[in-house]
């Protein structure tokens, strides 16, 4: 007996799609071996039509795919635009066609619906609108027009031209009588329900000369589109429900038991707690379409998702819907990285962000998720030398360590920095990851003075005290700018006296600026690292002023000014509206920026659900107010 299992008989109609799931024992060999779908010939051979190695027969070009789900031990063959020629005997299998690891499937495609026995067949998706056309003769032009539904043996009146509407159809049905020239009336039913399906009879007149027309209404539940994404990665659901629901509240829900569908997010501001920090509902276009992005995919996110439109912002009978079956691949290409990073107030965090290593030249971004409205993620920094103005001097995106990981360092932490941040690039949109920064109680490990004032032409020495716990780390000083932090020479001054209970392994490392110039003004960081992996940092702002008295300045911890909590913009600084230039590869579904370099004092857009927002100035233009 073959261990492969699937449907033995599949019956469908012309023009339809089928989705055939084949089950196999999920051994490691089976998971990774070739999967195929072949058609059995009269002489016993089996001709491959599609395989997991990328082969697609010309007969299936543009209308079929094969997707392997290794952690489930299944693969799925989708075939669209069926014709009667597709009827026949097939095999789904593993390995080589002629070997025994296969399962026989019979596919029968019958003629599509049409005018059968003078019955017009209407096939319409759930939640959509149907118009049933009913012709009549001149003698019945002035007579009552009606539509009945066959319930069991009896016809039940649905609507008539005298104003009656069956309660099951209230608010979603109308009867239109065409102008005098056309001998036709039509019944329009909106927000179709599954229960609306059945046999209808329309009638003009009530006597033996009445005109009658039969209609068969078939209401289809949308077949779920199969979506297969990696654990820890990202998924985007594109939902296009049509312009007729452009002004109706939209939702994405996840089916739980039975027909229950728990709202994940909707345009009325509801969001499921499990998706906090990792979901965005992107704005609707004029045609009513929208998209939902979920990052940091978890095993438990797998399931059936529906998007729809209803004034309640949740699934109701008659909601037009689209469906997806999300599978989360646990054999993920996206490496594990911490989902929570903790930092002490006043200190720093270094966040490692994974990206697709095949896209090392892609632009890297870091944004702060905001939960207001439908969620948005304003960009804070990118790898092209842009930093949001409020983050000058305390945020840096480094390409290190490279080879699939970049680093974001944020220092001078305050409680306001707690929240969810997204790592992303303008390349593979599946590699969007989420990290939560939590601010915890404690003291920063590195001790530096607060703001420091240097005198033009003189020498300035700035100390940084490293506790013994960092004895094995490389210690450095660097000057921050919007492209990173350029390393500077520093001097090891021996053990530090700044720590209680810390032995000779503590260190005082000083930065010396000789013959200070105006160009020396700015932010300086001292920090620790191991190879290309960064640890804690501390920041000092050095202001430069005119000479008052001769001599060099040697700054101690006690003499330093207190660092201001936040920089403010010069009064002359102009925040302009975000005119986001859309790079089609940079989240086609999100309003994000590709490049704003040409905009004077330009602001940066966000991965966003709003329209133009003021995001604060770009740090390409240095404005300090001390």
């Amino acid at each position: 007996k073959s261990p492969i299992f699937g449907p033995e008989e599949v019956n469908s109609v012309e023009g339809n799609s089928v989705s055939i799931t084949c089950y196999y024992p999920p051994t490691s060999v089976n998971r990774h071996t070739r999967k195929y779908w072949c058609r059995q010939g009269a002489r016993g051979g089996c001709i491959t039509l599609i395989s997991s190695e990328g082969y697609v027969s010309s007969k299936y070009a543009g209308r079929a795919n094969l997707t392997n789900f290794p952690e489930n031990g299944t693969f799925v063959v989708n075939i669209a635009q069926l014709s009667q020629d597709d009827s026949g005997r097939y095999k789904c299998g593993l390995g080589i066609n002629s070997r025994g690891l296969s399962f026989d499937v019979s596919l029968e495609v019958s003629q599509g619906p049409g005018l059968l026995n003078d019955t017009k067949v209407y096939t319409v998706d759930l939640g959509r609108t149907v118009t049933i056309n009913c012709p009549f003769k001149t003698e019945n032009a002035q007579k009552r027009k009606s539509l009945y539904k066959q319930i069991g043996l009896y016809p039940v009146l649905v609507i008539d031209s005298s104003g009656y509407v069956n309660p099951n159809y209230t608010g979603r049905i109308r009867l239109d009588i065409q102008g005098t020239g056309q001998l036709l009336f039509s019944v329009v039913i909106n927000q179709l329900r599954l229960s609306d399906a059945g046999q209808y009879l329309c009638q003009a007149g009530d006597d033996s000369n009445s005109n009658k027309k039969n209609a068969d209404l078939q209401v289809l539940k949308p077949e779920p589109e199969l979506v297969y994404e990696d654990l820890r990665g990202s998924v985007t659901f594109h939902c296009a429900l049509g312009p007729e629901v452009a002004n109706v509240a939209k939702f994405l829900c996840r089916q739980s038991s039975g027909e229950n569908c728990d709202v994940v997010v909707n345009t009325l501001g509801k969001r499921a707690p499990a998706f906090e920090g990792r979901i965005l509902l992107n704005p609707q276009d004029k045609d009513g379409s929208f998209s939902v992005v979920i990052t940091g995919l978890r095993k438990e996110d797998a399931g059936r998702y529906l998007c729809g439109a209803h004034s309640d912002g949740q699934l109701q009978e008659g909601s037009p819907i689209q469906a997806w079956q999300l599978f989360v691949n646990e054999e993920s290409t996206i490496p594990r990285s911490p989902t929570v990073v903790k930092g002490v107030a006043g200190s720093s965090v270094a966040v490692l962000c994974p990206y697709n290593r095949k896209e090392s030249k892609s632009i890297k971004y870091w944004c702060l998720w905001e939960g207001a409205q439908n969620g948005r993620c304003p960009l804070l920094v990118d790898s092209e030398g842009w930093v949001k103005a409020q983050y000058e001097g305390r945020l840096s995106l480094l390409e290190e360590p490279g080879n699939g990981t970049f680093t974001v360092i944020l220092n001078q932490l305050t409680s306001r920095d707690a929240g969810f941040y997204w790592c992303l690039t303008n390349g593979d949109t599946l590699w969007r990851t989420t990290v939560e920064i939590k601010i915890i109680e404690g003291e920063p490990n590195l001790k530096v003075p607060g703001n420091v004032t240097a005198v033009l032409g003189e020498t300035l020495k700035v100390p940084c005290h490293f506790p013994c716990k960092f004895s094995s780390y490389e210690k450095y000083w660097c000057k921050w700018n919007n492209t990173g932090c350029q390393a500077l020479p520093s001097q090891d001054e021996g053990p530090s006296k700044a720590f209680v209970n810390c032995d000779e392994n503590s260190r005082l490392v000083s930065l010396t600026l000789n013959l200070v110039t105006r160009a020396d003004e700015g932010w300086y960081w001292c920090g620790v690292k191991q190879g290309h992996f960064y640890g804690e940092t501390a920041a000092v702002y050095v202001a430069v002023e005119e000479r008052k008295a001769a001599g060099s300045r040697d700054v101690s911890l006690a003499k330093a000014d207190a660092a201001p909590d936040e920089k403010v913009l010069d009064s002359g600084f102009r925040e302009i509206e975000n005119k986001a230039i859309q790079d089609p590869r940079l989240f086609a579904e999100e309003k994000a920026v590709a490049d704003t370099r040409d905009q004077a004092d330009g602001s940066r857009a966000s991965v966003d659900s709003g329209s133009s927002e003021e995001q604060g100035g770009s740090s390409r233009h240095h404005h300090h107010h001390h």
Epitope: F5, P7, E8, E9, V10, N11, S12, V13, N16, S17, V18, S19, I20, Y23, T74, T123, L194, Q218, L220, K221, E223, Q255, S257, G258, E259, R304, Q325
Partner: nanobody
Amino acid sequence: EVQLVESGGGLVQPGGSLRLSCVASGLPGSSSRMAWFAQAPGKEREFVAAIAWRGRTSYKYYSDSVKGRFTVSGDNAKRTLDLQMKDLNPEDTALYFCAAHPNDDGDPRISGNYQYWGQGTQVTVSS
């Protein structure tokens, strides 16, 4: 309230035939999968056959032990499921349960992938 009611069970001689029927009432939405499971005394429920509907497409599944002998059929609109059983043998003796699920998720052979169950109808094959 969802109710699944089976009928058609009985005593039959080896080699004989039976037709089981199941009617589901109150099933939410458009039920996407219905199945037959058999439970012999002292044994676990075992998959027999299933039919799944997605739109205007139906998918029929059978266990190896009944292939070629049993035929599953049904009507999604009427919420009915039938099992035509031929060439019955004593190993087919069991309580036959009808099961239903409102979508077509998961392996149809696994009983845990069905939300609604009937009370069962007894089939005894004996001379």
